[in-house]
Protein backbone atom coordinates (compact mmCIF):
# COMPACT_ATOMS: atom_id res chain seq x y z
CA UNK A 1 0.00 0.00 0.00
CA UNK A 2 1.09 3.62 -0.56
CA UNK A 3 3.00 5.44 2.17
CA UNK A 4 1.16 8.31 3.73
CA UNK A 5 2.65 11.79 3.26
CA UNK A 6 4.40 13.29 6.30
CA UNK A 7 2.23 15.49 8.49
CA UNK A 8 2.45 19.05 9.83
CA UNK A 9 5.47 20.45 7.99
CA UNK A 10 6.85 23.66 9.51
CA UNK A 11 9.47 26.07 8.20
CA UNK A 12 11.53 27.99 10.78
CA UNK A 13 13.71 30.85 9.58
CA UNK A 14 15.98 32.41 12.21
CA UNK A 15 18.50 34.90 10.82
CA UNK A 16 20.05 33.02 7.88
CA UNK A 17 19.18 29.55 9.17
CA UNK A 18 16.41 27.66 7.35
CA UNK A 19 15.06 24.62 9.23
CA UNK A 20 12.27 22.24 8.23
CA UNK A 21 10.45 20.03 10.77
CA UNK A 22 7.68 17.52 10.16
CA UNK A 23 5.83 14.64 11.79
CA UNK A 24 5.91 11.05 10.55
CA UNK A 25 2.63 9.43 9.72
CA UNK A 26 1.93 6.39 11.92
CA UNK A 27 3.01 3.78 9.41
CA UNK A 28 6.15 5.61 8.25
CA UNK A 29 8.48 4.03 10.79
CA UNK A 30 11.44 1.78 10.13
CA UNK A 31 13.50 2.50 7.04
CA UNK A 32 11.39 5.41 5.83
CA UNK A 33 13.25 8.47 4.52
CA UNK A 34 11.96 11.91 3.57
CA UNK A 35 12.83 14.21 0.67
CA UNK A 36 11.92 17.77 -0.23
CA UNK A 37 11.73 19.69 -3.49
CA UNK A 38 11.46 23.43 -3.88
CA UNK A 39 10.22 25.78 -6.56
CA UNK A 40 11.04 29.46 -7.10
CA UNK A 41 8.75 31.96 -8.84
CA UNK A 42 8.68 31.76 -12.65
CA UNK A 43 9.83 28.11 -12.45
CA UNK A 44 7.71 25.28 -13.74
CA UNK A 45 9.90 22.46 -12.57
CA UNK A 46 10.67 21.35 -9.02
CA UNK A 47 14.28 21.08 -7.82
CA UNK A 48 15.70 18.83 -5.12
CA UNK A 49 16.18 20.81 -1.89
CA UNK A 50 19.86 20.49 -0.87
CA UNK A 51 20.37 19.21 2.67
CA UNK A 52 16.88 17.73 2.72
CA UNK A 53 17.15 14.52 0.66
CA UNK A 54 16.66 10.98 1.99
CA UNK A 55 16.39 12.22 5.57
CA UNK A 56 15.93 9.60 8.27
CA UNK A 57 15.17 12.21 10.94
CA UNK A 58 12.23 14.63 10.96
CA UNK A 59 14.30 17.78 10.70
CA UNK A 60 16.60 19.20 8.02
CA UNK A 61 18.61 22.35 7.39
CA UNK A 62 18.63 24.00 3.97
CA UNK A 63 20.60 27.13 4.90
CA UNK A 64 23.20 26.39 2.22
CA UNK A 65 20.64 27.18 -0.49
CA UNK A 66 21.09 30.74 -1.71
CA UNK A 67 17.56 32.07 -2.02
CA UNK A 68 16.31 35.53 -2.85
CA UNK A 69 14.90 36.43 0.55
CA UNK A 70 12.03 38.40 -1.04
CA UNK A 71 10.88 35.59 -3.38
CA UNK A 72 7.95 33.34 -2.56
CA UNK A 73 9.25 29.79 -2.20
CA UNK A 74 7.16 26.65 -2.60
CA UNK A 75 8.11 23.33 -0.93
CA UNK A 76 6.85 19.78 -1.21
CA UNK A 77 7.70 16.62 0.79
CA UNK A 78 7.28 12.91 0.39
CA UNK A 79 8.08 9.76 2.34
CA UNK A 80 10.16 7.02 0.67
CA UNK A 81 10.54 3.31 1.37
CA UNK A 82 10.35 0.73 -1.40
CA UNK A 83 7.55 2.76 -2.84
CA UNK A 84 7.11 6.49 -2.27
CA UNK A 85 4.20 8.51 -0.95
CA UNK A 86 2.56 11.14 -3.07
CA UNK A 87 4.03 14.62 -2.83
CA UNK A 88 2.54 16.81 -0.15
CA UNK A 89 2.79 20.52 -0.93
CA UNK A 90 3.70 22.80 1.98
CA UNK A 91 2.35 26.34 2.39
CA UNK A 92 4.57 28.68 0.39
CA UNK A 93 6.66 31.25 2.29
CA UNK A 94 8.75 34.37 1.70
CA UNK A 95 12.06 34.08 3.62
CA UNK A 96 12.28 37.70 4.78
CA UNK A 97 8.65 37.74 5.97
CA UNK A 98 9.06 34.43 7.71
CA UNK A 99 12.42 35.26 9.26
CA UNK A 100 12.68 35.75 12.99
CA UNK A 101 15.46 37.79 14.55
CA UNK A 102 17.84 35.56 16.44
CA UNK A 103 19.62 36.53 19.63
CA UNK A 104 22.36 39.16 19.32
CA UNK A 105 25.89 38.47 20.49
CA UNK A 106 26.72 40.11 23.82
CA UNK A 107 30.03 40.97 25.46
CA UNK A 108 30.16 42.45 28.98
CA UNK A 109 32.80 44.49 30.79
CA UNK A 110 32.56 45.20 34.50
CA UNK A 111 33.43 48.37 36.35
CA UNK A 112 32.91 48.93 40.07
CA UNK A 113 29.51 50.60 39.71
CA UNK A 114 28.71 49.99 36.06
CA UNK A 115 28.53 47.35 33.36
CA UNK A 116 29.41 48.15 29.74
CA UNK A 117 27.47 46.07 27.24
CA UNK A 118 28.73 45.55 23.69
CA UNK A 119 26.11 44.11 21.36
CA UNK A 120 26.73 42.68 17.88
CA UNK A 121 23.79 42.40 15.47
CA UNK A 122 22.06 39.04 15.03
CA UNK A 123 23.30 36.79 12.25
CA UNK A 124 26.81 36.74 10.87
CA UNK A 125 28.70 39.70 9.44
CA UNK A 126 27.87 38.55 5.90
CA UNK A 127 24.24 37.83 6.76
CA UNK A 128 21.99 38.04 3.70
CA UNK A 129 18.76 38.23 5.70
CA UNK A 130 19.78 41.38 7.59
CA UNK A 131 22.23 42.78 5.02
CA UNK A 132 20.17 45.95 4.59
CA UNK A 133 19.34 46.24 8.28
CA UNK A 134 22.54 45.59 10.24
CA UNK A 135 22.86 49.20 11.34
CA UNK A 136 19.10 49.57 12.01
CA UNK A 137 18.81 47.12 14.91
CA UNK A 138 17.83 48.48 18.29
CA UNK A 139 18.11 46.41 21.42
CA UNK A 140 16.35 46.00 24.72
CA UNK A 141 17.50 44.15 27.77
CA UNK A 142 16.39 42.83 31.10
CA UNK A 143 18.83 43.06 34.01
CA UNK A 144 18.61 41.76 37.56
CA UNK A 145 20.81 41.12 40.56
CA UNK A 146 21.69 37.45 40.68
CA UNK A 147 20.53 37.37 44.30
CA UNK A 148 17.13 38.92 43.51
CA UNK A 149 14.24 38.38 41.14
CA UNK A 150 13.51 42.07 40.63
CA UNK A 151 14.01 42.79 36.93
CA UNK A 152 14.67 46.13 35.29
CA UNK A 153 13.87 46.59 31.60
CA UNK A 154 15.87 48.97 29.44
CA UNK A 155 14.45 49.72 25.98
CA UNK A 156 15.86 51.22 22.77
CA UNK A 157 19.56 50.94 23.41
CA UNK A 158 22.27 50.81 20.78
CA UNK A 159 25.25 48.55 20.27
CA UNK A 160 27.23 49.93 23.19
CA UNK A 161 25.45 50.75 26.41
CA UNK A 162 26.63 51.53 29.91
CA UNK A 163 24.42 50.71 32.88
CA UNK A 164 25.49 52.89 35.80
CA UNK A 165 24.61 53.30 39.48
CA UNK A 166 25.20 49.63 40.28
CA UNK A 167 26.68 48.17 43.46
CA UNK A 168 30.34 47.07 43.63
CA UNK A 169 31.20 43.36 44.02
CA UNK A 170 27.72 42.28 42.98
CA UNK A 171 26.74 39.77 40.33
CA UNK A 172 24.27 41.04 37.77
CA UNK A 173 22.60 38.97 35.06
CA UNK A 174 21.04 40.18 31.85
CA UNK A 175 19.59 39.04 28.56
CA UNK A 176 19.27 41.02 25.35
CA UNK A 177 16.96 40.91 22.35
CA UNK A 178 17.09 42.75 19.04
CA UNK A 179 14.33 44.49 17.12
CA UNK A 180 13.90 45.95 13.65
CA UNK A 181 11.32 48.66 14.07
CA UNK A 182 11.18 49.33 10.32
CA UNK A 183 10.05 45.75 9.64
CA UNK A 184 8.06 45.45 12.87
CA UNK A 185 10.13 42.45 13.90
CA UNK A 186 11.05 41.72 17.49
CA UNK A 187 13.60 39.02 18.19
CA UNK A 188 13.98 36.47 20.92
CA UNK A 189 16.05 36.98 24.04
CA UNK A 190 19.52 35.54 23.87
CA UNK A 191 21.12 33.48 26.62
CA UNK A 192 21.56 34.93 30.10
CA UNK A 193 24.96 36.56 30.71
CA UNK A 194 26.19 37.22 34.24
CA UNK A 195 29.08 39.36 35.44
CA UNK A 196 30.35 40.57 38.80
CA UNK A 197 31.11 44.25 39.27
CA UNK A 198 34.62 44.95 40.54
CA UNK A 199 35.80 46.06 43.96
CA UNK A 200 35.04 49.75 44.51
CA UNK A 201 37.72 51.82 42.85
CA UNK A 202 39.84 54.01 45.12
CA UNK A 203 39.25 56.93 42.78
CA UNK A 204 35.67 57.80 41.83
CA UNK A 205 35.02 59.10 38.32
CA UNK A 206 34.65 62.87 37.77
CA UNK A 207 31.06 64.15 38.01
CA UNK A 208 28.80 67.00 36.85
CA UNK A 209 30.56 67.59 33.56
CA UNK A 210 29.40 70.59 31.54
CA UNK A 211 30.57 72.74 28.66
CA UNK A 212 30.26 76.52 28.74
CA UNK A 213 31.53 79.24 26.44
CA UNK A 214 33.89 81.79 27.99
CA UNK A 215 35.96 84.43 26.22
CA UNK A 216 35.11 82.84 22.89
CA UNK A 217 36.56 79.48 23.93
CA UNK A 218 34.90 76.31 25.16
CA UNK A 219 35.43 75.54 28.84
CA UNK A 220 34.80 72.00 30.02
CA UNK A 221 34.22 71.85 33.80
CA UNK A 222 33.70 69.00 36.22
CA UNK A 223 33.63 68.26 39.95
CA UNK A 224 36.07 66.03 41.76
CA UNK A 225 36.29 64.76 45.31
CA UNK A 226 40.06 64.88 45.83
CA UNK A 227 42.79 67.44 45.23
CA UNK A 228 46.18 66.99 43.52
CA UNK A 229 44.83 64.98 40.63
CA UNK A 230 45.45 65.03 36.89
CA UNK A 231 42.63 64.64 34.38
CA UNK A 232 42.26 63.72 30.74
CA UNK A 233 39.33 64.32 28.45
CA UNK A 234 38.30 62.29 25.42
CA UNK A 235 35.71 62.78 22.71
CA UNK A 236 33.80 60.65 20.23
CA UNK A 237 31.43 61.39 17.35
CA UNK A 238 28.04 60.69 18.93
CA UNK A 239 26.64 58.72 15.98
CA UNK A 240 29.44 56.15 16.34
CA UNK A 241 27.75 55.06 19.57
CA UNK A 242 25.47 53.02 17.33
CA UNK A 243 28.43 51.37 15.61
CA UNK A 244 30.96 50.13 18.19
CA UNK A 245 32.02 47.40 15.78
CA UNK A 246 33.18 50.02 13.28
CA UNK A 247 36.91 50.71 13.36
CA UNK A 248 36.26 54.46 13.62
CA UNK A 249 34.81 53.94 17.10
CA UNK A 250 37.85 55.42 18.83
CA UNK A 251 37.75 57.83 21.74
CA UNK A 252 40.19 60.66 21.01
CA UNK A 253 42.25 62.98 23.16
CA UNK A 254 41.48 66.68 23.31
CA UNK A 255 45.06 67.98 23.13
CA UNK A 256 44.43 70.98 25.42
CA UNK A 257 42.86 68.68 28.01
CA UNK A 258 45.58 66.06 28.45
CA UNK A 259 46.98 65.78 31.96
CA UNK A 260 45.34 68.95 33.28
CA UNK A 261 45.63 69.56 37.02
CA UNK A 262 42.53 71.76 37.38
CA UNK A 263 38.90 70.62 37.26
CA UNK A 264 38.41 72.40 33.97
CA UNK A 265 40.09 72.74 30.63
CA UNK A 266 39.86 75.33 27.91
CA UNK A 267 39.93 74.43 24.23
CA UNK A 268 39.40 76.47 21.09
CA UNK A 269 36.18 76.01 19.12
CA UNK A 270 38.02 74.83 16.02
CA UNK A 271 38.80 71.64 18.00
CA UNK A 272 35.40 70.44 16.77
CA UNK A 273 33.61 70.79 13.50
CA UNK A 274 29.86 71.30 13.59
CA UNK A 275 28.25 68.18 15.02
CA UNK A 276 27.27 66.21 18.08
CA UNK A 277 29.98 64.67 20.24
CA UNK A 278 30.31 62.73 23.45
CA UNK A 279 32.82 63.87 26.07
CA UNK A 280 34.19 61.94 29.04
CA UNK A 281 36.72 62.68 31.79
CA UNK A 282 39.06 60.44 33.76
CA UNK A 283 41.02 61.20 36.94
CA UNK A 284 44.44 59.92 37.96
CA UNK A 285 46.68 60.41 41.01
CA UNK A 286 49.78 59.01 39.32
CA UNK A 287 49.30 55.48 40.67
CA UNK A 288 45.59 54.85 40.26
CA UNK A 289 43.13 55.82 37.56
CA UNK A 290 39.39 56.29 37.92
CA UNK A 291 36.88 54.76 35.56
CA UNK A 292 35.62 57.17 32.92
CA UNK A 293 32.91 59.59 33.92
CA UNK A 294 29.40 59.46 32.56
CA UNK A 295 29.49 60.63 28.94
CA UNK A 296 27.92 63.99 28.21
CA UNK A 297 26.50 65.04 24.87
CA UNK A 298 28.06 68.14 23.35
CA UNK A 299 26.26 69.73 20.40
CA UNK A 300 28.42 72.47 18.91
CA UNK A 301 25.36 74.26 17.53
CA UNK A 302 23.19 74.17 20.61
CA UNK A 303 25.78 74.40 23.38
CA UNK A 304 27.97 77.05 21.83
CA UNK A 305 26.51 80.45 22.52
CA UNK A 306 25.82 82.77 19.62
CA UNK A 307 28.75 85.11 19.22
CA UNK A 308 28.20 88.83 18.69
CA UNK A 309 28.42 89.95 15.08
CA UNK A 310 31.35 91.96 13.76
CA UNK A 311 30.61 94.91 11.50
CA UNK A 312 32.17 97.72 9.46
CA UNK A 313 30.68 101.20 9.29
CA UNK A 314 30.96 103.42 6.23
CA UNK A 315 30.03 107.00 6.89
CA UNK A 316 27.97 109.09 4.45
CA UNK A 317 26.61 112.63 4.98
CA UNK A 318 23.15 111.72 6.23
CA UNK A 319 23.48 107.99 6.82
CA UNK A 320 25.69 105.18 8.05
CA UNK A 321 26.14 102.02 6.00
CA UNK A 322 26.74 98.94 8.19
CA UNK A 323 28.15 95.68 6.80
CA UNK A 324 27.76 92.77 9.20
CA UNK A 325 30.25 89.92 8.98
CA UNK A 326 30.73 86.54 10.62
CA UNK A 327 31.97 86.74 14.20
CA UNK A 328 35.55 85.68 14.89
CA UNK A 329 36.83 83.21 17.44
CA UNK A 330 39.77 84.21 19.61
CA UNK A 331 42.33 83.05 17.03
CA UNK A 332 40.64 85.22 14.37
CA UNK A 333 38.94 82.33 12.57
CA UNK A 334 35.42 83.11 11.33
CA UNK A 335 32.61 81.22 13.03
CA UNK A 336 30.39 79.23 10.70
CA UNK A 337 26.80 79.73 11.84
CA UNK A 338 24.74 78.22 9.08
CA UNK A 339 21.39 78.68 10.75
CA UNK A 340 19.38 81.86 10.05
CA UNK A 341 20.19 84.95 12.13
CA UNK A 342 18.43 88.24 12.66
CA UNK A 343 20.39 91.31 13.73
CA UNK A 344 19.40 93.89 16.32
CA UNK A 345 21.26 97.18 15.84
CA UNK A 346 21.20 99.93 18.47
CA UNK A 347 22.50 103.40 17.60
CA UNK A 348 22.59 106.79 19.29
CA UNK A 349 24.21 110.18 19.06
CA UNK A 350 27.41 110.13 21.06
CA UNK A 351 26.22 113.13 23.11
CA UNK A 352 22.84 111.57 23.85
CA UNK A 353 21.56 108.55 25.72
CA UNK A 354 18.51 108.09 23.46
CA UNK A 355 19.02 104.71 21.73
CA UNK A 356 17.18 103.80 18.57
CA UNK A 357 16.73 100.19 17.40
CA UNK A 358 16.71 98.56 13.96
CA UNK A 359 16.02 94.84 13.43
CA UNK A 360 17.15 93.39 10.09
CA UNK A 361 17.63 89.96 8.51
CA UNK A 362 20.08 91.37 5.97
CA UNK A 363 23.79 91.83 6.61
CA UNK A 364 23.85 95.17 4.79
CA UNK A 365 21.99 97.86 6.68
CA UNK A 366 21.71 101.61 6.05
CA UNK A 367 20.69 103.91 8.91
CA UNK A 368 19.12 106.91 7.10
CA UNK A 369 18.14 110.48 8.08
CA UNK A 370 21.15 111.29 10.26
CA UNK A 371 22.71 114.70 10.97
CA UNK A 372 25.92 115.51 9.11
CA UNK A 373 29.19 115.92 11.05
CA UNK A 374 27.73 114.12 14.04
CA UNK A 375 29.29 111.20 15.92
CA UNK A 376 26.95 108.21 16.14
CA UNK A 377 27.65 105.06 18.15
CA UNK A 378 26.50 101.58 17.13
CA UNK A 379 26.36 98.16 18.76
CA UNK A 380 24.70 94.99 17.49
CA UNK A 381 23.72 91.54 18.56
CA UNK A 382 22.51 88.42 16.76
CA UNK A 383 19.37 86.40 17.46
CA UNK A 384 18.83 82.90 16.16
CA UNK A 385 15.70 82.54 14.03
CA UNK A 386 15.75 78.78 14.50
CA UNK A 387 12.99 77.66 16.89
CA UNK A 388 15.16 74.84 18.24
CA UNK A 389 18.06 77.11 19.16
CA UNK A 390 16.24 80.26 20.37
CA UNK A 391 19.40 82.04 21.44
CA UNK A 392 20.79 85.56 21.42
CA UNK A 393 24.36 86.78 21.47
CA UNK A 394 25.65 89.46 23.78
CA UNK A 395 26.04 92.90 22.21
CA UNK A 396 29.15 93.61 20.22
CA UNK A 397 31.64 96.26 21.26
CA UNK A 398 30.45 99.81 20.58
CA UNK A 399 31.78 101.43 17.40
CA UNK A 400 31.46 105.20 16.91
CA UNK A 401 31.70 107.00 13.58
CA UNK A 402 31.17 110.59 12.45
CA UNK A 403 28.89 111.34 9.50
CA UNK A 404 30.36 113.37 6.64
CA UNK A 405 29.57 117.02 5.91
CA UNK A 406 26.36 117.73 4.02
CA UNK A 407 27.92 118.34 0.58
CA UNK A 408 29.77 115.05 0.41
CA UNK A 409 28.82 113.06 -2.67
CA UNK A 410 27.68 109.51 -2.12
Amino acid sequence: KNLKSPQKVEVDVIDDNFILRWNRSEESVGNVTFSFDYQKPEMDNWIKLPGCQNMTSTKCNFSSLKLNIYDEIKLRIRAEKENTSSWCEVDSFTPFRKAQIGPPEVHLEAEDKAIVIYISPPGTEDSVMWALDRSSFTYSLVIWKNSSSVEERIENIYSRHKISKLSPETTYCLKVKAALLTSRKIGVYGPVHCIKTTVENELPPPENIEVIVQNQNYVLKWDYTYANMTFQVQWLHAFLKRKPGNHLYKWKQIPDCENVTTTQCVFPPNTFQKGIYLLRVQASDGNNTSFWSEEIKFDTEIQASLLPPVFNIRSLSDSLHISIGAPKWSENKPVIQDYPLIYEILFWENTSKAERKIIKKKTDVTIPNLKPLTVYCVKARAHSMDEKLNKSSVFSDVVCEETKSGNTSK
Epitope: E125, D126, R134, N246, K252, Q253
Partner: antibody
Protein backbone atom coordinates in the same frame (compact mmCIF):
# COMPACT_ATOMS: atom_id res chain seq x y z
CA UNK B 1 48.85 72.43 7.64
CA UNK B 2 48.22 68.67 7.47
CA UNK B 3 50.95 66.83 5.55
CA UNK B 4 51.86 63.22 4.89
CA UNK B 5 55.41 62.90 3.58
CA UNK B 6 56.36 59.53 2.11
CA UNK B 7 59.83 58.07 1.63
CA UNK B 8 61.41 58.00 -1.83
CA UNK B 9 61.08 55.53 -4.70
CA UNK B 10 62.67 52.10 -4.28
CA UNK B 11 64.09 49.60 -6.79
CA UNK B 12 64.48 46.10 -5.36
CA UNK B 13 65.12 42.53 -6.40
CA UNK B 14 62.69 39.67 -5.74
CA UNK B 15 63.23 38.15 -2.28
CA UNK B 16 64.61 41.34 -0.75
CA UNK B 17 63.00 43.10 2.19
CA UNK B 18 61.75 46.69 2.26
CA UNK B 19 60.25 49.19 4.67
CA UNK B 20 58.69 52.42 3.41
CA UNK B 21 57.52 55.28 5.62
CA UNK B 22 54.89 57.99 5.91
CA UNK B 23 55.44 60.91 8.29
CA UNK B 24 52.37 62.83 9.48
CA UNK B 25 52.49 66.45 10.62
CA UNK B 26 50.14 69.36 11.27
CA UNK B 27 47.60 67.29 13.22
CA UNK B 28 47.31 64.99 16.25
CA UNK B 29 48.89 61.86 14.82
CA UNK B 30 47.40 59.56 17.49
CA UNK B 31 43.81 60.68 16.79
CA UNK B 32 43.59 59.40 13.19
CA UNK B 33 44.03 56.13 11.35
CA UNK B 34 46.72 55.87 8.70
CA UNK B 35 45.75 53.77 5.68
CA UNK B 36 48.04 52.19 3.09
CA UNK B 37 46.74 51.96 -0.47
CA UNK B 38 48.26 50.05 -3.40
CA UNK B 39 47.91 51.05 -7.03
CA UNK B 40 49.44 48.63 -9.51
CA UNK B 41 50.45 50.06 -12.90
CA UNK B 42 47.34 51.10 -14.86
CA UNK B 43 45.02 49.66 -12.21
CA UNK B 44 42.67 50.91 -9.48
CA UNK B 45 43.08 51.60 -5.77
CA UNK B 46 43.30 48.78 -3.23
CA UNK B 47 43.21 49.34 0.51
CA UNK B 48 45.89 47.20 2.16
CA UNK B 49 45.20 47.96 5.80
CA UNK B 50 44.99 50.65 8.44
CA UNK B 51 46.71 51.45 11.72
CA UNK B 52 45.54 53.63 14.62
CA UNK B 53 48.73 55.00 16.18
CA UNK B 54 46.88 55.97 19.39
CA UNK B 55 46.60 52.32 20.45
CA UNK B 56 48.44 50.46 17.65
CA UNK B 57 45.22 48.81 16.46
CA UNK B 58 45.94 47.30 13.02
CA UNK B 59 43.36 45.98 10.55
CA UNK B 60 44.58 44.25 7.39
CA UNK B 61 42.43 43.82 4.30
CA UNK B 62 41.95 40.07 3.71
CA UNK B 63 44.06 39.86 0.54
CA UNK B 64 47.04 41.58 2.22
CA UNK B 65 46.95 39.71 5.53
CA UNK B 66 50.28 37.92 5.95
CA UNK B 67 51.77 39.61 2.87
CA UNK B 68 52.84 42.89 4.48
CA UNK B 69 53.36 44.35 7.95
CA UNK B 70 51.96 47.72 8.99
CA UNK B 71 53.41 49.54 11.99
CA UNK B 72 53.75 53.02 13.46
CA UNK B 73 56.01 54.95 15.81
CA UNK B 74 53.90 57.64 17.44
CA UNK B 75 56.94 59.31 19.04
CA UNK B 76 58.10 60.37 15.57
CA UNK B 77 54.58 60.47 14.03
CA UNK B 78 55.52 57.95 11.34
CA UNK B 79 53.72 54.92 9.91
CA UNK B 80 55.45 52.10 8.04
CA UNK B 81 54.66 49.44 5.46
CA UNK B 82 57.09 46.57 5.12
CA UNK B 83 57.74 43.38 3.14
CA UNK B 84 60.03 40.56 4.26
CA UNK B 85 60.34 39.06 0.78
CA UNK B 86 59.35 41.10 -2.24
CA UNK B 87 57.82 39.64 -5.40
CA UNK B 88 57.65 41.11 -8.90
CA UNK B 89 53.89 41.48 -8.39
CA UNK B 90 54.56 43.95 -5.54
CA UNK B 91 55.60 46.52 -8.16
CA UNK B 92 53.18 49.40 -7.60
CA UNK B 93 52.66 52.90 -6.27
CA UNK B 94 51.96 52.85 -2.53
CA UNK B 95 50.07 55.73 -0.94
CA UNK B 96 49.48 56.50 2.70
CA UNK B 97 46.39 58.48 3.68
CA UNK B 98 44.92 59.92 6.85
CA UNK B 99 41.62 58.24 7.66
CA UNK B 100 38.70 59.29 9.81
CA UNK B 101 34.94 59.89 9.62
CA UNK B 102 35.51 61.89 6.44
CA UNK B 103 37.19 59.04 4.58
CA UNK B 104 40.80 59.39 3.38
CA UNK B 105 41.02 63.16 3.62
CA UNK B 106 44.79 63.72 3.18
CA UNK B 107 47.12 61.63 1.02
CA UNK B 108 50.87 61.30 0.66
CA UNK B 109 52.36 61.72 -2.82
CA UNK B 110 53.08 58.00 -3.06
CA UNK B 111 56.14 55.78 -3.01
CA UNK B 112 56.90 53.90 -6.22
CA UNK B 113 58.24 50.41 -5.52
CA UNK B 114 59.76 48.52 -8.45
CA UNK B 115 60.67 44.86 -7.99
CA UNK B 116 62.67 43.40 -10.85
CA UNK B 117 65.44 40.88 -11.26
CA UNK C 1 34.54 41.75 2.06
CA UNK C 2 32.16 44.31 0.55
CA UNK C 3 32.55 44.49 -3.23
CA UNK C 4 31.86 47.83 -4.93
CA UNK C 5 30.98 47.79 -8.63
CA UNK C 6 31.15 51.06 -10.54
CA UNK C 7 29.33 51.82 -13.77
CA UNK C 8 29.96 52.72 -16.45
CA UNK C 9 33.61 51.75 -16.78
CA UNK C 10 34.19 54.71 -19.09
CA UNK C 11 31.99 57.75 -19.62
CA UNK C 12 32.58 60.01 -22.65
CA UNK C 13 31.03 63.46 -22.33
CA UNK C 14 31.64 67.04 -23.43
CA UNK C 15 32.35 70.03 -21.17
CA UNK C 16 29.10 71.58 -19.93
CA UNK C 17 27.27 68.22 -19.89
CA UNK C 18 26.06 66.37 -16.80
CA UNK C 19 27.87 63.24 -15.58
CA UNK C 20 26.22 60.55 -13.46
CA UNK C 21 28.50 57.87 -11.98
CA UNK C 22 27.08 54.87 -10.14
CA UNK C 23 28.45 52.58 -7.49
CA UNK C 24 26.70 49.45 -6.22
CA UNK C 25 27.72 47.59 -3.06
CA UNK C 26 27.43 43.82 -2.64
CA UNK C 27 25.79 44.41 0.74
CA UNK C 28 24.32 47.38 2.55
CA UNK C 29 26.76 50.12 3.54
CA UNK C 30 26.03 52.87 6.04
CA UNK C 31 25.95 56.13 4.08
CA UNK C 32 28.00 57.71 6.90
CA UNK C 33 30.95 55.64 5.70
CA UNK C 34 30.84 56.10 1.94
CA UNK C 35 33.16 58.35 -0.11
CA UNK C 36 34.09 59.38 -3.64
CA UNK C 37 37.59 60.26 -4.89
CA UNK C 38 39.05 61.78 -8.04
CA UNK C 39 42.44 60.80 -9.43
CA UNK C 40 44.33 62.46 -12.25
CA UNK C 41 47.34 60.86 -13.99
CA UNK C 42 50.52 61.04 -11.90
CA UNK C 43 48.69 62.41 -8.85
CA UNK C 44 47.44 60.99 -5.55
CA UNK C 45 43.66 60.59 -5.26
CA UNK C 46 41.67 63.50 -3.83
CA UNK C 47 38.66 63.23 -1.53
CA UNK C 48 35.51 64.70 -3.10
CA UNK C 49 32.55 63.44 -1.09
CA UNK C 50 32.31 61.75 2.31
CA UNK C 51 29.29 60.50 4.23
CA UNK C 52 27.72 59.77 0.80
CA UNK C 53 26.66 63.40 0.30
CA UNK C 54 28.95 65.86 2.16
CA UNK C 55 31.43 67.78 0.00
CA UNK C 56 35.03 67.82 1.19
CA UNK C 57 36.75 71.17 1.74
CA UNK C 58 37.23 73.12 -1.48
CA UNK C 59 35.00 70.92 -3.64
CA UNK C 60 32.65 72.98 -5.85
CA UNK C 61 28.90 72.51 -5.55
CA UNK C 62 28.76 71.24 -9.15
CA UNK C 63 29.66 67.91 -7.55
CA UNK C 64 27.11 66.12 -5.41
CA UNK C 65 26.75 62.68 -3.92
CA UNK C 66 23.61 60.76 -3.06
CA UNK C 67 22.38 57.28 -2.24
CA UNK C 68 22.05 54.82 0.61
CA UNK C 69 22.06 51.09 1.28
CA UNK C 70 23.62 49.50 -1.78
CA UNK C 71 23.25 52.20 -4.46
CA UNK C 72 25.25 55.42 -4.53
CA UNK C 73 25.65 58.13 -7.17
CA UNK C 74 28.13 60.91 -7.89
CA UNK C 75 26.74 63.69 -10.09
CA UNK C 76 28.70 66.48 -11.77
CA UNK C 77 26.21 69.00 -13.15
CA UNK C 78 28.27 71.08 -15.61
CA UNK C 79 31.49 69.39 -16.61
CA UNK C 80 34.61 71.55 -16.60
CA UNK C 81 37.86 70.53 -18.35
CA UNK C 82 39.46 69.79 -14.95
CA UNK C 83 36.74 67.20 -14.14
CA UNK C 84 38.02 64.67 -16.68
CA UNK C 85 39.77 62.05 -14.55
CA UNK C 86 39.19 58.65 -12.90
CA UNK C 87 36.62 58.49 -10.09
CA UNK C 88 36.57 55.87 -7.34
CA UNK C 89 33.89 55.07 -4.79
CA UNK C 90 34.89 53.68 -1.39
CA UNK C 91 33.22 52.14 1.64
CA UNK C 92 34.76 52.30 5.10
CA UNK C 93 31.81 50.83 7.00
CA UNK C 94 33.93 47.73 7.45
CA UNK C 95 37.62 47.86 8.43
CA UNK C 96 38.25 45.79 5.30
CA UNK C 97 37.98 49.06 3.37
CA UNK C 98 37.25 48.63 -0.33
CA UNK C 99 37.24 50.80 -3.45
CA UNK C 100 35.28 50.39 -6.66
CA UNK C 101 37.26 49.57 -9.79
CA UNK C 102 36.92 53.16 -11.03
CA UNK C 103 35.04 55.08 -13.73
CA UNK C 104 37.11 56.93 -16.32
CA UNK C 105 35.47 60.21 -17.31
CA UNK C 106 36.90 61.27 -20.67
CA UNK C 107 36.32 64.14 -23.08
CA UNK C 108 34.10 63.18 -25.99
Amino acid sequence: EVQLVQSGAEVKKPGESLKISCKGSGYIFTNYWIAWVRQMPGKGLESMGIIYPGDSDIRYSPSFQGQVTISADKSITTAYLQWSSLKASDTAMYYCARHDIEGFDYWGRGTLVTVSS
Amino acid sequence: EIVLTQSPGTLSLSPGERATLSCRASQSVSSSFFAWYQQKPGQAPRLLIYGASSRATGIPDRLSGSGSGTDFTLTITRLEPEDFAVYYCQQYDSSAITFGQGTRLEIK
